[in-house]
């Protein structure tokens, strides 16, 4: 049965030509957490896997970083980057877990973290 | 339990535009995830065509982009697909599917084969 | 695009026995292979996801192995309703792509 649930930094914004980090947790499971993929709808971004380590994918290797953690940092943000960014933590026993972020990039200097909020 | 069933004719002449449509129940579309189209010629492997996301946002197979059309009626819980310009080798089995974020395929519908011949 | 090469196009074998079937890539996908299972007239059932990660309820028979262009496929002791075409997919980047199938019948 899965119990746990994800936590993010939810919906986020950030300016243009910045920097900012997607984080999740996994909080309330005991499961073992083996890989952490990073997508976007159409594309994924980077892969944490227990074993192997890091990947990241060639389209992104300039401007993500792995880290801190399972976390990834996207950095020299353009207004495309705008957009939804999915953790999804591949567990044992569990199974998955999805987590979902918002990113909006703002010309401006108006940017500043939403709320946080949890997906079961 | 989320089921997709796909509908249309199954015969479309020539040079003419297949049309499908694919009934979603079990789950909102406008919800969350992607909704793909899925084709497979007779004795064939799969080939994927493209998706609407449950925002309304797009993606097509860059081989196929000129002809393809991915639409949604969110009032009846469908999302369609247009195919232009049919020739025999578009003959196939057309599936619906639901796509996990991670860009695999947990849903299918039972498909439905579309014969292109005069 | 990514090719993704499937061998043997077919395997003839028998209840009990052990099958493993492979998949490479034309360019390196880390770990994003799918597994899929499809009986004529059916749609594909997936099986494994993330090249090694059973699907719900999938039976524990089935394993996927593999990271970086080279993917295994494997079922530990083919039962009667094994019997069927396998495809693999990878979901590393658009357009999404399968291998050309395999298909398992009996020996």
């Known amino acids: 049965m899965m119990t746990g649930t994800i936590e993010t930094t939810g919906n986020i914004s950030a300016e243009k030509g910045g920097s900012i980090i997607l984080q999740c947790h996994l909080s309330s499971t005991t499961a073992q957490v083996t890989q952490v993929n990073w997508e976007q709808q159409d594309q994924l971004l980077a892969i944490c896997n227990a074993d192997l380590g890091w990947h990241i994918s060639p389209s992104f290797k300039d401007r993500v970083a792995p880290g801190p953690g399972l976390g990834l940092t996207l950095q020299s943000l353009t207004v495309n980057d705008t957009g939804e960014y999915f953790c999804i933590y591949h567990t044992y026993p569990d199974g998955t877990y999805t987590g979902r972020i918002f990113l909006e990039v703002l010309e401006s200097s108006v940017a500043e973290h939403g709320a946080r909020f949890q997906i079961p | 339990q989320v089921q997709l069933q796909e509908s249309g004719p199954g015969l479309v002449k020539p040079s003419q535009t297949l049309s499908l449509t694919c009934t979603v129940s079990?789950?909102?579309?406008?919800?969350?995830?992607?909704w793909n189209w899925i084709r497979q010629p007779p004795g064939k492997g799969l080939e994927w065509m493209g998706y609407?996301?449950?925002?309304?946002?797009?993606r097509y197979n860059p081989s196929l982009k000129s002809r393809i059309t991915i639409s949604r009626d969110t009032s009846k819980n469908q999302f369609s697909l247009k195919f232009s310009s049919v020739t025999a080798a578009d003959t196939a089995v057309y599936y619906c599917?639901?796509?996990?974020?991670?860009?695999?395929?947990?849903?299918w519908g039972q498909g439905t084969l579309v014969t292109v011949s005069s | 695009d990514i090719q993704m090469t499937q061998s043997p196009s077919s395997l003839s074998t028998s209840v009990g026995d052990r099958v493993t079937i492979t998949c490479k890539a034309s360019?390196?996908?880390?770990?994003?292979v799918a597994w899929y299972q499809q009986k004529p007239g059916k749609a594909p059932k997936l099986l494994i996801y993330?090249?090694?990660y059973r699907y719900t309820g999938v039976p524990s028979r089935f394993s996927g192995s593999g990271s970086g262009t080279d993917f295994t496929f494997t079922i530990s002791s083919v039962q009667p309703e094994d019997f069927a075409t396998y495809y693999c997919?990878?979901?590393?980047?658009?357009?999404?792509?399968f291998g050309q199938g395999t298909r398992l019948e009996i020996k």
């Open positions: 079990g789950y909102s579309i406008t919800s969350d995830y992607a």
């Open positions: 609407i996301s449950y925002s309304g946002n797009t």
């Open positions: 599917s639901r796509k996990y974020y991670g860009s695999w395929f947990p849903y």
């Open positions: 997919q990878q979901h590393y980047s658009t357009p999404w792509t």
């Open positions: 360019q390196d996908v880390f770990t994003a």
């Open positions: 993330s090249a090694s």
